[in-house]
Interface confidence: low
Amino acid sequence: FERTRSLQDPCSNCPAGTFCDNNRNQICSPCPPNSFSSAGGQRTCDICRQCKGVFRTRKECSSTSNAECDCTPGFHCLGAGCSMCEQDCKQGQELTKKGCKDCCFGTFNDQKRGICRPWTNCSLDGKSVLVNGTKERDVVCGPSPADLSPGASSVTPPAPAREPGHSPQ
């Protein structure tokens, strides 16, 4: 069994926004400027994040919470807590190591971020293509040709699906 500690850790009394200062006989000292402690009982304060360059400040640092960053226009956040800013591309493009590249035929991206994805294969659901896909938009699937009433005009069925390519790196 575990014995209960007879002496309480003096640092446990230090609230958020302070640190237990070993250099001053473990008294609770306020976090210095540009630092914070978000929980009690800390032996150090953490340096505030600085939102520089492509990062901009979404929330200022306080003694009890870190600054929060987002990205300047033309970039978007990636990673935990916006740890990185990635360049935006246009709709119909994806970001590669060589910059923004147009989506390959058969793929689309309707956002300024992320990757090109294959058009929906309508025939897999027994449907036909109602509106053709573009680099920016997925195809729109309509009713299956059999569902169309006689005499109704039918959109040309799609070519056989092929494995979509990827933008060159």
Epitope: K52, V54, L78, G79, C85, E86, Q87, L95, K97
Partner: antibody
């Protein structure tokens, strides 16, 4: 060309500290995170933490948070990793590797040659 | 932390044979997975990122697939220079975590 050149092998006593360096060249030092990854003999890879040279912002693996300190010297484009309270299980090759700030998929694209740290009494 | 389970831990294959290595994440990591090759005494080398994108200069016999939790690295025709240990890495969340590695040997 991009190069990350690490300091030489170290032999340390248990309980002591070691400070390794990683000198970068061939790219804009401040635009890439420097990560530290270690590999114990015959074992896998383990991420320890990273630092963004522009503002020295750091992320640490909780496993190492109390023992690792990451710093940079922008004037020499050098990153440092200090590991304290060394124990025998810290014997490993320590690598520095980089990640581009602006492109999330550039994870660990270039690596240093590694530094062997041996902890032995 | 996200756990990455890589299998098999080692395999033996003949030259020219197709080799498949799998990596399973303990949670959805989108496509934020990369593959590394490491030869003895050397640093790892990035082969594939975003699950299926080949790094410039890496032979086309290497390919990656998968998304979500299940990922595969395939060597379509094993060559002598492919003898190495291969690691997957998830970078969807901090801390980035590696699989345990797969050692590929010649039969």
């Amino acid at each position: 060309q991009v190069q990350l050149v690490q300091s030489g092998a170290e032999v340390k006593k248990p309980g002591s500290s070691v400070k390794l360096s990683c000198k970068a060249s061939g790219y804009t030092f401040s635009s890439y995170w420097i990560n530290w990854v270690r590999q114990a003999p015959g074992q896998g890879l383990e991420w320890m933490g990273n630092i963004y040279p522009s503002d020295s912002y750091t992320n640490y693996n909780q496993k190492f948070k109390d023992r690792v300190t990451l710093t940079v010297d922008k004037s020499t484009s050098t990153a440092y990793m200090e590991l304290s309270s060394l124990r025998s299980e810290d014997t490993a090759v320590y690598y520095c590797t980089r990640t581009w700030e602006f492109y999330y998929d550039s994870v660990f694209d270039y690596w240093g040659q590694g530094t062997l740290v041996t902890v032995s009494s | 932390d996200i756990q990455m389970t890589q299998s098999p831990s080692s395999l033996s294959a003949s030259l020219g044979e197709r080799v498949t290595i799998t990596c399973k994440a303990s949670q959805d990591i989108n496509s934020y997975l990369s593959w590394y090759q490491q030869k003895p005494g050397k640093a790892p080398k990035l082969l594939i990122y975003r699950a299926n994108r080949l790094v410039d200069g890496v032979p086309s016999r290497f390919s990656g697939s998968g998304s979500g939790q299940d990922f595969t690295l395939t060597i379509s025709s094993l060559q002598p220079e492919d003898i190495a240990t291969y690691y997957c890495l998830q970078y969807d969340e901090l801390p980035p975590t590696f699989g345990g590695g797969t050692k590929v040997e010649i039969k």
